[in-house]
């Protein structure tokens, strides 16, 4: 199955643009509870040189702070390295760039290892369509349905998205 592996225009760049967080999951519930380190929300993404740059919204003191992060490519095509509250192996588990994206992270912080998954969509009005896919990916990586938190508009910094 040889092929042209040079990424063409419209390759990883298809992930660029606005995204909306829909659901989070973790084996450590404190991480995704309000004020948890991983209760963060995607605002937008861009791709350059095979790396993913994300603007995320972090709730802080009743407001939302926008922070820029970069996930660096690795030798494995769907795996990226991200430094955020320790080291994260970030995996893009299931992707449709025009519709939804499911990622999960293996986080290592102070000798503690955690698993966090994130569902994001392009169009919030279709968020229910992709929850079954998220539940399925969570199941595949060992997270149960009761470890999933579906976000509401109030949760995800909707007022801070401009």
């Amino acid at each position: 199955q040889e092929g042209n592996h040079e990424e063409p225009q419209g390759g990883l760049e298809e992930l660029s643009g606005r995204w909306h967080s829909v659901a989070l999951a973790s084996n450590k519930s404190d991480l995704i509870k309000p004020w948890g380190h991983f209760r963060v929300f995607i605002h937008s993404m861009s791709a350059k040189d095979g790396n993913l740059h994300g603007d995320i919204l972090i709730p802080q003191d009743g407001q939302c702070e926008k922070v820029s992060l970069t996930a660096f490519k690795t030798a494995t095509s769907n795996k990226f390295d991200l430094e955020y509250w320790g080291h994260n192996d970030l995996y893009l588990a299931e992707v449709d760039p025009k519709s939804y994206l499911i990622l999960y992270m293996i986080n290592q912080y102070n000798d503690d290892t955690s698993l966090v998954a994130h569902l994001m969509v392009r169009d919030l009005s279709r968020q229910q369509d992709f929850l079954p896919a998220f539940e399925s990916v969570c199941e595949d990586i060992g997270l149960h349905k009761d470890q999933i938190v579906v976000l509401s508009d109030d949760d995800r910094c909707q007022g801070s998205r401009d």
Epitope: Q1, E2, G3, N4, H5, E7, P8, G10, G11, L12, E14, S77, N78, L92, E94, V95, D96, P97, K98, S99, Y100, D129, A133, S136
Partner: nanobody, 125 residues
Framework: EVQLVESGGGLVQARGSLRLSCAAS????????MGWFRQAPGKEREFVAA????????YYAGSVKGRFAISRDNAKNTVDLHMNSLKPEDTAVYYC??????????????????WGQGTQVTVSS
């Protein structure tokens, strides 16, 4: 084990049309991509078009955009490639492929796990 069978190839005049079909049998993934790739003699296999089973999202190589259309029938596990305004440079063996919605399925062959045997398309001038 998934099996993919292509059909519909053949010889056609330039500016003509063909419809390729790919039938998948066996156990597929929950959500998957089906793609078409092609390989001309002496060239590398290249992406042509792909579609997601759950969303119907489609992607095309720049060289075929506006001329080719990919469509799916999930109930029958088939994907068709409608090829119009064919050019001699479209001559190649066309392969159908199936895989999960891994990063890159919309432009790259690597995310695909299963491949058909290919069907020859020849466009004469």
């Amino acid at each position: 084990e998934v099996q993919l069978v292509e059909s519909g190839g053949g010889l056609v005049q330039a500016r003509g049309s063909l419809r390729l079909s790919c039938a998948a049998s066996g156990r597929t993934f929950n959500n998957y991509a089906m793609g078409w790739f092609r390989q001309a003699p002496g060239k590398e296999r290249e992406f042509v078009a792909a579609i997601a089973s759950n969303t119907g999202t489609t992607y095309y190589a720049g060289s075929v955009k506006g001329r080719f259309a990919i469509s799916r029938d999930n109930a029958k596990n088939t994907v068709d490639l409608h090829m119009n305004s064919l050019k001699p440079e479209d001559t190649a063996v066309y392969y159908c492929a199936l895989g999960p919605l891994r990063l890159g399925w919309w432009y790259d062959s690597r995310p695909y796990d299963y491949w058909g045997q290919g069907t020859q398309v020849t466009v004469s001038s």
